[in-house]
């Protein structure tokens, strides 16, 4: 807290300008009106203020906007932004594109802080769903933001949002995000020819079940190694070995660097030996000849 | 880019003066703030003058105040340092630096300039 | 405000691990910055607002504390790393720099 001190003689600020930068923080408290603060914000980061002048301007406007600040403040705040709290933003009411991207402008170089989650948080809900302007700038600012994000927002996803991903931007989800994204990509891209089809939807086949695997198989898409090791291990038990050489085509023969890790090492487990074999990659694992196989799950769903 | 270039630099007896020159180009040098930093040899930094964009509003170490000038002018991109009443402990490499963030840091500094003051 | 740097100097290998501390005189909130210089050089924005990286610095330098203690940390020490290194601080006026870290080659 400041102590209220009167405003020495000729230092009462009649504009926000160059001239506070060496007001004390008592200075600042006593000579700017809070008012006036409001209405010139958009100069407060032509200042090179310190970040006690801002604690004490922000003083001010909290005592200005006990309730929160209106969306006239809150878009020009610039680098005061970095010192509002999670409890702050809660109070506001953010309802525009453009005052988003003027706060996620201040905190770029910033990890995704509290703040900014709670403003995402607050914005999003305000406009119902993530649509795809908001995911464009969000993604633009955050590549992982929508990886941070749980299954359950993920489904308030549109479709015509997957657009604006990026590769990048899914580099730190989880299967379960990439199940509920996946079916989106796929109607985001349906009317995509093969290999365009392919390039787009490839960062989110870590959710494509088997049969959609076992259709890429089919159209020489030359899948590299690193796409593959991210496929859901259940969607590639099921593929044939033929399959498997179909969907990776010359990048087949990554299998044998890959070949004691997950899903390579399980599916290699699934496979005759002979057809393995057929392969001439020297991988080894597999059901000898003459083992017959029980599928156990099918028997049990039978009975 | 950003660039800032120092000149004016040199050898002066103790009591002479200098006048430092920073040269800016890629960015639009009337609307930032500047500083001159200072580093005596072998030794650390020190924050030696400011000078808002405007050139209104103006900050002195006291180890210079009295002493040093700093000014700018807008329309030749330029900024200076009028130093008088050299002393020893002046002897330094002089940087100018941009606060282009409009941040109490320094965002891009010149090459430096060395003054040396001894008899 | 006063910074203090610690160590004064340090001898490592590329690929080490550094961390540098700052420490300052009363709390700064998270006004800090770190800056690079090299032999004969300007020094170099690396770090700003304590943690945040500046533009176009290599992922390897990060930058954390809040209060009165700081770090900065150089995951895996590259060749070109060994330099000087500073702290300072815009909590308030007059901005104030540390005495700086010399990190040599062991």
């Known amino acids: 807290e400041v102590e209220k001190t009167a405003c020495p003689s000729g230092k009462k600020a009649r504009e926000i300008d160059e001239s506070l930068i060496f007001y004390k923080k008592w200075e600042l408290e006593a000579c700017v009106d809070a008012a006036l603060l409001a209405t010139q914000m958009d100069r407060v980061n032509a200042i090179p203020f310190t970040y006690e002048q801002l604690d004490v301007l922000k003083h001010k406007l909290d005592e200005l906007y006990p309730q929160g600040y209106p969306e006239s403040v809150i878009q020009h705040l610039g680098y005061l932004f970095l010192k509002m709290s999670p409890e702050d933003i809660r109070k506001w009411n953010v309802t525009s594109l453009e005052t988003l991207k003027a706060l996620l402008e201040v905190n770029k170089g910033h990890e995704m802080s509290p703040q900014v989650a709670t403003l995402i948080d607050r914005f999003v809900k305000g406009r119902g769903q993530l649509d795809k302007d908001t995911l464009d700038t969000l993604t633009a600012f955050y590549p992982g933001y929508l990886c941070s994000l749980s299954p359950e927002e993920l489904s308030s996803v549109p479709p015509s949002s997957i657009w604006a991903v990026r590769p990048q931007d899914l580099d730190t989800c989880d299967p379960r995000q990439l199940d509920v994204l996946y079916p989106k990509a796929r109607l985001a891209f349906q009317n995509m020819n093969g290999s365009e089809y392919f390039v787009k939807i490839q960062s989110f086949l870590g959710g494509a079940p088997t049969e959609d695997l076992k259709a890429l198989s089919q159209q020489n898409v030359s899948m590299d190694l690193a796409t593959f090791m991210k496929l859901r291990t259940d969607a590639v038990l099921p593929l044939t070995v033929a399959e498997v050489q179909k969907l990776l085509g010359p990048h087949v023969e990554g299998l044998k660097a890959e070949e004691r890790h997950r899903p390579v090492r399980d599916w290699i487990l699934r496979q005759r030996q002979d057809d393995l074999d057929t392969l001439g990659l020297g991988l080894q694992g597999g059901i000898p000849n003459g083992y017959l196989v029980l599928d156990l799950s099918m028997q049990e769903a039978l009975s | 880019q950003v660039q800032l270039v120092e000149s004016g630099g040199g050898l002066v007896k103790p009591g002479g003066s200098l006048r430092l020159s920073c040269a800016a180009s890629?960015?639009?040098?009337?609307?930032?703030?500047m500083s001159w930093i200072r580093q005596a040899p072998g030794k650390g930094l020190e924050w030696v003058s400011y000078i808002s964009s405007s050139g209104s509003t103006i900050y002195y170490a006291d180890s210079v105040k009295g002493r040093f000038t700093i000014s700018r002018d807008n329309a030749k991109n330029s900024l200076y340092l009028q130093m008088n009443s050299l002393r020893a402990e002046d002897t330094a490499v002089y940087y100018c630096?941009?606060?282009?963030?409009?941040?109490?840091?320094?965002?891009?500094w010149g090459q430096g300039t060395l003054v040396t003051v001894s008899s | 405000i006063q910074l203090t740097q610690s160590p004064s100097s340090l001898s490592a290998s590329v690929g080490d691990r550094v961390t540098i501390t700052c420490r300052a005189s009363?709390?700064?909130?998270?006004?800090l910055a770190w800056y690079q210089q090299k032999p004969g050089k300007a020094p170099k924005l690396l770090i700003y607002d304590a943690s945040s990286l500046e533009s176009g610095v290599p992922s390897r330098f990060s930058g954390s504390g809040s209060g009165t203690d700081f770090t900065l940390t150089i995951s895996s020490l590259q060749p070109e790393d060994f330099a000087t290194y500073y702290c300072q601080q815009f909590n308030s006026y007059p901005l104030t720099f540390g005495g700086g870290t010399k990190v040599e080659i062991k």
């Open positions: 890629g960015f639009t040098f009337s609307d930032y703030y």
């Open positions: 009363q709390g700064i909130s998270s006004a």
């Open positions: 630096a941009v606060h282009l963030k409009r941040r109490p840091y320094f965002d891009y």
